[in-house]
Amino acid sequence: APVPPGEDSKDVAAPHRQPLTSSERIDKQIRYILDGISALRKETCNKSNMCESSKEALAENNLNLPKMAEKDGCFQSGFNEETCLVKIITGLLEFEVYLEYLQNRFESSEEQARAVQMSTKVLIQFLQKKAKNLDAITTPDPTTNASLLTKLQAQNQWLQDMTTHLILRSFKEFLQSSLRALRQM
């Protein structure tokens, strides 16, 4: 697994470097998670032909994965910092159960899957420090999460492969949208 942000050898070798600002730390954390997702996608694509599946076929899935919409205030038109930040944190919290699902889905990248999960937790904590209105954030209901996880794990092999691919693709897209929005804040 790659070394988490702030622990690479360059950081150790340059103690005089200015400490990262909160925004830089968040940016670096997202890019680190995106690198981890790329590695996981590589294993998924090597293992199955899901990556060639047409967008239309993938769109027919019934997964309720977090997605950015116009009303979330994260796009350039209608940008709203606080609304967007709430959406990013809420979305990341909603992705947690899907990241839990991914934990047993990889053979050679098991550590990488765990690193993505743990790094996402760290990112959520960074973002919470930035948010002014935590009351607007609804956390996932554990009972709902449990039945979702059970349902996902009960799928046949082909559907599990498809689900893994969809989670990684959606999470990547969500993080990329988040990164663009956070750079405007």
Epitope: I124, P142, T143, T150
Partner: nanobody, 118 residues
Framework: AVQLVDSGGGLVQAGGSLRLSCAAS????????MGWFRQPPGKVREFVGR???????NYADSVKGRFTISRDNNNNTVYLQMNRLKPEDTAVYYC????????????WGQGTQVTVSS
């Protein structure tokens, strides 16, 4: 598994306050979510509020602004501070822990009775 022990219930007059505690013992206590539920007499158990691993809290509409959940990780304890109590808050209160994001509430306290008299 984690053992949860609820305490702090009692008889209180309408408008009064109580603080319930939920102490955890067992393996390392860092659950995904801790929740409070209640079961009024003759009714089904209902959600009161929860606090997730990162400290974000959510409450049922009926208790918003009156009840506050907090946690003390050093003492492995979660609290439910109940202010401006009403007779309809009378119930057995339970705390519950979800150990992981996909586990559901997999540990429950034994419950503590709260009675609010008018």
């Amino acid at each position: 598994a984690v053992q949860l022990v609820d305490s702090g219930g009692g008889l209180v007059q309408a408008g009064g306050s109580l603080r319930l505690s939920c102490a955890a013992s067992g393996r390392t206590f860092s659950p995904y979510t801790m929740g409070w539920f209640r079961q009024p007499p003759g009714k089904v158990r209902e959600f009161v509020g929860r606090i997730n691993w990162s400290g974000i809290r959510n409450y049922a509409d009926s208790v918003k602004g009156r009840f506050t959940i907090s946690r003390d990780n050093n003492n492995n304890t979660v609290y439910l501070q109940m202010n401006r109590l009403k007779p309809e808050d009378t119930a057995v209160y339970y705390c519950a822990a979800a150990s992981q994001s996909g586990s559901g509430y997999d540990s429950w306290g034994q419950g503590t009775q709260v009675t609010v008299s008018s």
